[in-house]
Interface confidence: medium
């Protein structure tokens, strides 16, 4: 089990580092988006794990961005960002087989309502229970 957890961590960290770099290979990214969405978490250890991902970086005040799957839907009543940005992207999390192009990458500023906690502990719990 410890070996499995180490392997999982390696895969996840690599997925985060390479997020969005290859539009033809998105299965791992979409799976990880699904994990974040379902477990209500963001990143492996912390949301800051996403800050190293070049394709998510904006400029200036938008330098820190994370995938939309990090967005805490229950924490906002901003219907504009929900309807126009978040929900259309999150709806695809139910259809993981669908291919995605880099232009479709949904990212939100870290300043918005994103999950506070990394996914490591939740995933490890899930592994222990299955």
């Amino acid at each position: 089990r410890a070996q499995l957890e180490r392997s999982l961590r390696d895969v996840v960290e690599k997925t985060i580092q390479k997020y969005g770099t290859n539009p033809e290979e998105t299965a791992a990214e979409e799976s990880w988006d699904y994990v974040q969405f379902q477990l209500r978490c963001c990143g492996w250890h912390y949301p800051q794990d996403w800050f190293q991902v070049l394709i998510l970086r904006g400029n200036g005040s938008e330098a820190h961005r994370v995938p939309c799957s990090c967005y805490n839907l229950s924490a906002t009543n901003d219907s504009t960002i929900l309807d126009k940005v978040i929900l259309p992207q999150l709806s695809r999390l139910g259809h993981l087989a669908r291919s995605r192009h880099s232009a479709d990458i949904c990212a939100v500023p870290a300043e918005s309502h994103i999950y506070r906690e990394g996914c490591a502990q939740g995933l490890q719990k899930w592994l222990h229970n299955n």
Epitope: R40, C41, C42, H45, Y46, P47, Q48, H64, N72, A75, A110, E111, H113, I114, Y115, R116, E117, Q121, G122, K125
Partner: antibody
Framework: SVEESGGRLVTPGTPLTLTCTVS????????MNWVRQAPGKGLEWIGI?????RTDYASWAKGRFTISKTSTTVELKITSPTTEDTATYFC?????????????WGPGTLVTVSS | AYDMTQTPSSVEAAVGGTVTIKCQAS??????LAWYQQKPGQPPQLLIH???TLASGVPSRFKGSGSGTQFTLTISGVQSDDAATYYC????????????FGGGTEVVVK
């Protein structure tokens, strides 16, 4: 609401466990922080327990404190108290969203460590 | 390490005057900063979160501003009830931290 209990006079080296009882919200979706305040001093962050049960501690608090939880309580164990641990201990809720602040706070419980 | 430096440690203000308290983070914390008010014998109370958002029930004379590493709490039209100690706290990181709080600023109202 949030309420701490368990504070009392203890002798140095005697382990002490403080309890924070919560109502009106779920520990499954909220993180909880422990903060202390020595008499006449400022606020000092001790650590946090996340919704998943993962914990983080202030660098000075590692090994000196242990945070754990049940479905409705959060515990802070002071493993080997010294006189420097004399303080009022607060627990406070933090939401599940990054950037959430500490609210509400409990009234605090006083720990006095003296021989 | 995300150390928080708060200045001044104490300030006097006249009723109706303005108080400015500054908080500096040692690294960029985006806007993950909160301000608390604490009166003697009471727990801290949340005033402002996300650097500038007023907590529920907090009077509009309290204003938070700033982002990155520099933050300010301004109390305009100071009232005698504002006499308290004010603390800033970073909410950006809990990893390898000495303290998430600033050292506090005592506001004395004349």
């Amino acid at each position: 609401s949030v309420e701490e209990s368990g504070g009392r006079l203890v002798t140095p080296g005697t382990p002490l466990t403080l309890t924070c009882t919560v109502s009106g919200f779920s520990l499954s979706y909220n993180a909880m922080n422990w903060v202390r305040q020595a008499p006449g001093k400022g606020l000092e962050w001790i650590g946090i327990i996340f919704a998943s049960g993962r914990t983080d501690y202030a660098s000075w608090a590692k090994g000196r404190f242990t945070i754990s939880k049940t479905s409705t309580t959060v515990e802070l164990k002071i493993t080997s108290p010294t006189t420097e641990d004399t303080a009022t201990y607060f627990c406070a809720r933090e939401g599940s969203t990054w950037g959430d602040a500490l609210d509400p706070w409990g009234p605090g419980t006083l720990v006095t460590v003296s021989s | 390490a995300y150390d928080m430096t708060q200045t001044p440690s104490s300030v006097e203000a006249a009723v109706g005057g303005t108080v400015t308290i500054k908080c500096q983070a040692s690294q960029n914390i985006i806007d993950y900063l909160a301000w608390y008010q604490q009166k003697p014998g009471q727990p801290p109370q949340l005033l402002i979160h996300k650097a500038s958002t007023l907590a529920s029930g907090v009077p509009s004379r309290f204003k938070g501003s700033g982002s990155g590493t520099q933050f300010t709490l301004t109390i305009s039209g100071v009232q005698s009830d504002d006499a308290a100690t004010y603390y800033c706290q970073q909410g950006y990181s809990n990893s390898n931290i000495d303290n998430t709080f600033g050292g506090g600023t005592e506001v004395v109202v004349k």
